[in-house]
């Protein structure tokens, strides 16, 4: 056969679906690889062909579209399972071709089992809600295209294993779950089960997401430098190790990049000749506020080093701050015998 543009196995799109539920999988060619859509390709006389490789097999085989009740079907650029079975797991390929053109891509599909409390190996999307902020909502994800708008599905929401019906701050409103207030106690996994009829059969779609309650923008402040501060003086003798921690608190801010850095005499440590090492550690509060500590270390400090300016800088979407460390050379203690001798006029 003639050459085919093979985009290989697209592992970026690891698709996971639940066993015994409908699944609609769009051919990734039109989503991510080609500059035209299925309609354009179809009008140009191109044909979309599907085949698959079963789990732990090397043999590519055609997909059986003649199963009872059309369990697997193709509609335009979508491969449909009504419903999936565990042994549908494998690598699926969609190939677009005519006599002069060919392009194909493979992607892994994993059919996953869930228990009665919706626990499964499924990777869960995370939705962040601001703490004590007012009405916020989560939406049952990835249910578009499964049923026409004329069909009114039944939606049931669960937190963990429990049906949500009398949680005082959480209100199920169809495809949305509304939080009148979000509290730390609302952290957890939320599942929507969408039930809809189709051709005399009833199908269920199960979607789980993780809710993480984070710091509210109402309470967000610019970075706060806890150390260095005016109360601590780093007093060292030449030859000793100088350790200065820069500890900065950052309020949680959605999509904010938090940065901490040191300057020595106005320059980044990489741009000067001193032998400096900087170690960073990061910790988070329950609402994802962040504390970053960068420890500046000079193993054997010189008297020159003790005259330099050491400034800790911090930046977030809320602003930039800086604080200089108080560094000084320790005055050596008087050596008793010499002082005494001088006092008696000895030479």
């Amino acid at each position: 056969s003639e050459r085919c543009d093979d985009w290989g196995l697209d592992t970026m799109r690891q698709i996971q679906v639940f066993e015994d539920e409908p699944a609609r999988i769009k051919c990734p060619l039109f989503e991510h690889f080609l500059k035209f859509n299925y309609s354009t390709a179809h009008s140009a006389g191109l044909t979309l062909i599907w085949y698959w490789t079963r789990q732990d097999r090397d043999l590519e085989e055609p997909i059986n579209f003649r199963l009872p009740e059309n369990r697997i079907s193709k509609e335009k650029d979508v491969l449909w399972f009504r419903p999936t079975l565990l042994n549908d797991t494998g690598n699926y390929t969609c190939m677009l071709r005519n006599t002069t053109y060919c392009s194909k891509v493979a992607f892994p599909l994993e059919v996953v089992q869930k228990d009665s409390c919706f626990n499964s190996p499924m990777k869960l999307p995370v939705h962040k809600l601001y703490i004590e902020y007012g009405i916020q909502r989560i939406t049952c994800p990835n249910v578009d295209g499964y049923f026409p708008s004329s069909v009114k599905p039944t939606i049931t929401w669960y937190m963990g294993c429990y049906k949500i019906q009398n949680f005082n701050n959480v209100i199920p409103e169809g495809m949305n779950l509304s939080f009148l207030i979000a509290l730390i106690s609302n952290n957890g996994n939320y599942t929507c089960v969408v039930t809809y009829p189709e051709n005399g059969r009833t199908f269920h779609l199960t979607r789980t997401l993780t809710v993480k309650v984070v710091g509210s923008p109402k309470n967000a402040v610019p970075p706060v430098i806890h150390s260095p501060n005016d109360h601590v003086v780093y007093e060292k003798e030449p030859g000793e190790e100088l350790l200065i921690p820069c500890t900065v608190y950052f309020s949680f801010l959605m999509d904010s990049r938090n940065e901490v850095w040191w300057t020595i005499d106005g320059k980044k440590p990489d741009d000067i000749t001193i032998d400096v090492t900087i170690n960073e550690s990061i910790s988070h509060s329950r609402t994802e506020d962040e504390t970053r500590t960068q420890i500046l270390s000079i193993k054997k400090v010189t008297s020159e080093d003790l005259k330099r300016s050491y400034v800790c800088h911090a930046r977030s979407a809320k602003g930039e701050v800086a604080k200089a460390a108080k560094v000084k050379q320790k005055v050596p203690a008087p050596r008793y015998t010499v002082e005494l001798a001088c006092g008696f006029g000895a030479t």
């Epitope: 019906q165 009398n166 005082n168 209100i171 199920p172 169809g174 207030i181 109402k218």
Partner: antibody, heavy 117, light 110 residues
Amino acid sequence: SLEESGGDLVKPGASLTLTCTASGFSFSSSYYMCWVRQAPGKGLEWIACIYAGSSGVTYYASWAKGRFTISDTSSTTVTLQMTSLTAADTATYFCASETDGNYFNLWGPGTLVTVSS
Amino acid sequence: ALVMTQTPSPVSAAVGGTVTINCQASEDIYSNLAWFQQKPGQPPKLLIYRASTLASGVPSRFSGSGSGTEFTLTISGLQSDDAATYYCLGVYTYSTDIHAFGGGTEVVVK
């Protein structure tokens, strides 16, 4: 239980603050506390709610915004400040809360506010 | 704003009979509806929440049904103690007024 206090006979244009006191529980875990009123011989009318014990997330009926203010003043009291009172505000004012996540499950006996010249 | 409309009022039935009260929401409020009973000189009492779930301690002769915009409270095996005014309460977070009571329905027991 809940108990309202502060109801009084006031003149039109006056201000008044009603207090709802909880006994047997405190608002530390963000209780949903609401005020509802009932004019003599009329139906129930929702005024406002607050998540007491939190950062004071509040919800108001559109007609009550601006003239009525709900707030939590301690771990066991919620107040309703009312300004520019008119005869139409004459009613029994109830404080209602949730228990076990059920809205308006717990009610106080009510306090009467009469606005008359 | 969310508007709750209750019908009919008043409604009367004999002891042992059945009474049906309807409540219509101006918006699709799914199952976010509660029913209350109020007797003269008393605060309201929660009977049903989430449209059909009986509140604790409420007799099983009270039942609720419906979802979306149409809801019903049914009192079967009517007792003289059931003479009261009944209110529905809708919850709708998309409205400026997230809570709204119906106008009330008086039940008279003959």
